[in-house]
């Protein structure tokens, strides 16, 4: 299936150029998408190209501008929020980044009714997060490690925490396990609906062994980083959550929600805290060994003025092949009845399905099915349920918004997007305005990124919001790869795969073969997305065939691929990456003297693997950021696949899995390492470890570190990468420069 | 460019009432958010009460219970009825989107002034 055919006729041929690494690098072919930040059913803000806030109302098609440029460059202000009850923005400046999602910033008040910044009992700067109760304008923020409450912008804080310490205690946010690996945000304080209750955890990270590398700046003395960062098997960070009534802080204090008693009898994490009203939340807990959640259902006693979980509201989530859940266990979403609710998880048949829970797990109605996945459930209103899978034409590595009418008997289920823009558009998100009023659909491709906004009752197109104009007439004189999507079958395993094929492809020449390889679990690389970077340029400018593959341990196809590495990383995931390229081998055109296999963190450890595999089919490879050992990375990350490195659970694959044990495979490739010294995710001592096991071993290799960069390798250290990595293949591939 | 007039105002003794109105020209009123603003002498500019496209309102601390605010579609007509004045709700009362457009798009406003 050919998605992005070229362009290229022969009267045109002395007109069209391919791509440059330059383009790549410059960001020459960036696209843009459009997401409404919504305020009502029918209005939305949008920061516009000259930075505007402007107010756009659907129904009357108007818009004006809240808030100017003038005034957001009064204080640097990269980002704003308004207050619900539209009476202040927050702007954010000095942004800090810190981990992945965390960063630090100055906040400043500005008062729409007066035009004027609030003055006096001004914010502490820098803040490590701030946001508004989602009705009136009441404010909550995060300074130093504890937790701040403001009944309006000029008010004295109210302190709601006082132990918060670097390093040791972190209230109201996660510290970097749990923001890395289990909440996906800088944040871990939750208000209730109304505003009444805000709800907060605090991680205790005293007994947590610290990572340490330098970080070598400009100054005389390197500084050192510290973080407290559990690797696998090692001591744990410490949870609670507490609720506090932020209408009378003072009157009892932050209360401690309960943890589930099956739950408490081991170690555990929290996962994840959904209010349902003002006066009943949702808290999702799992055991340490990650094949068991359990979802707490807690109610406000106002007679005790406590929280209380009542058993009967406990409901466990099991896996008896793998883990719970995909990458992370589902959420919930609840109906209108404040009790039941809809949630995604494993039916009796290993595909992830939409489940409506009234009383039980075990009397659960499943609402979607067959062999492919419901991934996201967007919104649940009174007669409709939208959500995305990968269901329309078999395509696991498509996504499709598609609506349940719960209202009626029997549901029916309608795609909303699947014959939309079906050649350019098949791998979409969504963005639903309160009472799924009105809709932004974000299309990624296979073609040009399109935005639309949509009717919430009858799904037609208002307008487009973005459309890439500028992208599709500046790529109309580019020679762009040919991509196509297809599936191998191997011993009752589907691998599917994307190949990417220079303009002028021919098949009876023979090409040089890269493969592109990530690999994780309940990771997908093979999709339908729009994509012009680095493997793009190499396919258009240097003739390779670059070749992406979904390997068991991959996303979306149901839990027999899913859980097929489970306490086995490092086996499968590298056997159907060769398996692959022997089949591409088959198919005649690829050159089986030059190819190589390159990936970044955890591609970078199966492209290790793969390289030291002794198959003799790679040439060359490249590892970024690799993992080497699993007794290195993130404990949650790392336990949830593995279990723990210890004798009497699954130590021995731990060793048996390390990057370091092949060093002596590595002696008939070339390998090209590459790190950053400040990577604070997969650290250093990972690609430390591999240098020295093949320097032991007296294996040549070729290296390159980054000062001072971090997981990312972002900035200049992105071009020096690219160019660092395309000098090599082009080496390996014997390719003149 | 939709036009918007105040009108109402006047003279009144404290614990007394008066209905504010502002006529919206422009169409389909019903979803847009509205808003009441003052200006009391010497002081700046606040929100009273607003009211989204939804009909959901929002008023400040200090008129909560006394003022409500309202909306006629068919006449394209905003109404801040304000019942149990107090001498400190004497100000210029103007009426904008909610919240309001940026620059001078502030009307003439209505006086309301409240005698002890």
């Known amino acids: 299936i050919v998605l992005r055919p070229s362009r290229v006729h022969n009267s045109e041929e002395n007109t069209m150029r391919a791509l440059t690494l330059k383009d790549i690098l410059n960001g020459t072919f960036s696209y843009k998408t459009f997401f409404p930040n919504w305020i009502s059913g029918q209005e939305y803000l949008h920061q516009s190209a000259d930075n505007n806030i402007v107010l756009y109302n659907i129904e009357t098609g108007q818009s004006y501008t809240i808030l100017s440029n003038r005034t957001m460059k009064s204080v640097n202000a990269s980002n704003y929020g308004l207050s619900p009850d539209r009476q202040f923005v927050y702007l954010e400046s000095d942004y800090s980044k810190l981990w992945r999602y965390s960063y630090t910033a100055t906040y400043y008040i500005y008062d729409l009714s007066n035009g004027e910044f609030v003055r006096g009992n001004e914010l502490p700067r820098p803040i490590q997060y701030l946001c508004w109760s989602p009705v009136g304008s009441k404010l909550a923020y995060v300074y130093q490690n504890n937790i701040y409450l403001k009944q309006r912008p000029g008010d004295p804080p109210f302190q709601i925490t006082f132990n918060g310490r670097e390093n040791k205690i972190f209230n109201g946010i996660p510290d970097w396990v749990y923001e890395e690996e289990m909440l996906a945000t800088k944040y871990a304080l939750w208000w209730s609906p109304n505003g009444k209750f805000l709800a907060y955890a605090e991680f205790n990270d005293t007994d947590i062994p610290v990572i340490a590398y330098s970080y070598y700046g400009d100054e005389q003395y390197p500084r050192t980083i510290n973080i407290p960062y559990p690797k696998a098997g090692a001591k744990n960070p410490v949870v609670r959550i507490f609720i506090i009534d932020t209408t009378y802080p003072a009157y009892v204090g932050p209360q401690e929600v309960p943890v589930p008693a099956m739950i408490a009898s081991s170690d555990y994490y929290f996962s994840w805290l959904t209010w349902v009203t003002d006066e009943r939340v949702c808290l999702q807990w799992l055991k340490r060994v990650q094949n068991v959640s359990v979802l707490s259902i807690c109610d406000f006693r106002e007679d005790w003025q406590t929280w209380d979980c009542p058993k009967t509201q406990e409901h466990i989530e099991e896996s008896r092949t793998g883990w719970a859940g995909g990458f992370f266990v589902s959420t919930p979403v609840f109906s209108y009845d404040a009790i039941s609710y809809y949630k995604i998880f494993s039916d009796k048949d290993g595909y992830k399905h939409i489940h409506y829970i009234k009383d039980t797990v075990e009397n659960a109605i499943q609402i979607t099915s067959g062999k492919w996945e419901a991934i996201n459930i967007f919104r649940v209103t009174q007669d409709s349920l939208f959500y995305s899978s990968n269901e329309f034409e078999e395509y696991p590595g498509r996504r499709n918004i598609y609506r349940i009418s719960i209202g009626s008997y029997p549901p029916s289920k309608k795609c909303v997007t699947c014959h939309l823009r079906k050649e350019r558009c098949q791998y979409y998100t969504a963005s639903f305005s309160d009472y799924a009023k009105y809709y932004a659909l974000v299309c990624y491709g296979p073609g040009i990124p399109i935005s639309t906004l949509h009717d919430g009752r009858t799904d037609q197109e208002i307008k487009i919001l973005e459309e890439n104009k500028e992208l599709e007439n500046a790529l109309k004189n580019i020679q762009l790869p040919k991509e196509e999507i297809k599936k191998l079958e191997v011993d009752e395993i589907t691998l599917w795969y994307k190949m990417i094929l220079p303009p002028q492809f021919d098949r009876s020449k023979k090409y040089p073969l890269l493969i592109q390889v990530y690999g994780g679990p309940c990771s997908q690389s093979v999709r339908s997305v729009f994509a012009v970077n680095w493997i793009s340029y190499l396919a258009s400018k240097e003739g390779m065939v670059i070749a992406l593959v979904d390997g068991r341990g991959t996303a979306f196809q149901g839990d027999k691929l899913l859980y097929a590495v489970y306490r086995k990383l490092g086996v499968y995931e590298v056997e159907d990456q060769i398996t692959a390229v022997r089949k591409f081998i088959e198919m005649g055109f690829i050159d089986e003297k030059r190819i190589a296999i390159w990936g970044w963190s955890y591609g970078g450890y199966v492209s290790s693997l793969a390289l030291a595999s002794g198959t003799g089919l790679f040439k060359c490879g490249i590892a970024v950021a690799p993992v080497s050992s699993w007794e290195y990375y993130a404990s949650v990350y790392t336990e949830r696949f593995m279990g723990l490195p210890t004798k009497d659970d699954n130590l021995e694959h731990y060793k048996n899995s390390t990057v370091m044990a092949r060093a002596e495979y590595f002696r008939n490739v070339d390998y090209l390492l590459i790190h950053g010294t400040a990577d604070d995710n997969v650290h250093f001592q990972n690609s430390a470890q591999i240098a020295k096991a093949l320097v032991n071993a007296q294996v040549d290799f070729q290296a390159m570190w980054y000062s001072d960069q971090n997981h990312g390798l972002s900035g200049l250290s992105t071009n020096h990468l690219y160019t660092h990595m395309t000098h090599f293949l082009k080496q390996c591939f014997s390719l003149s420069d | 460019q939709v036009q918007l007039q105040e009108s109402g105002g006047g003279l009144v003794q404290a614990g007394g009432s008066l209905r504010l109105s502002c006529a919206v020209s422009g169409r389909l009123f019903s979803t847009n958010a509205m808003g009441w603003y003052r200006q009391a002498p010497g002081k700046q500019r606040e929100l009273v009460a607003g009211?989204?496209?939804?009909?959901?309102?929002n008023y400040a601390d200090s008129v909560k219970g006394r003022f409500t605010i309202s909306r006629d579609n068919g006449k394209n007509t905003l109404y801040l009825q304000m019942n149990s004045l107090k001498p400190e709700d004497t100000a210029v009362y103007y009426c904008?989107?909610?919240?309001?457009?940026?620059?001078?798009?502030w009307g003439q406003g209505t006086q309301v002034t409240v005698s002890s």
């Open positions: 904008n989107f909610y919240p309001p457009i940026v620059g001078d798009y």
């Open positions: 009211i989204t496209g939804g009909d959901r309102s």
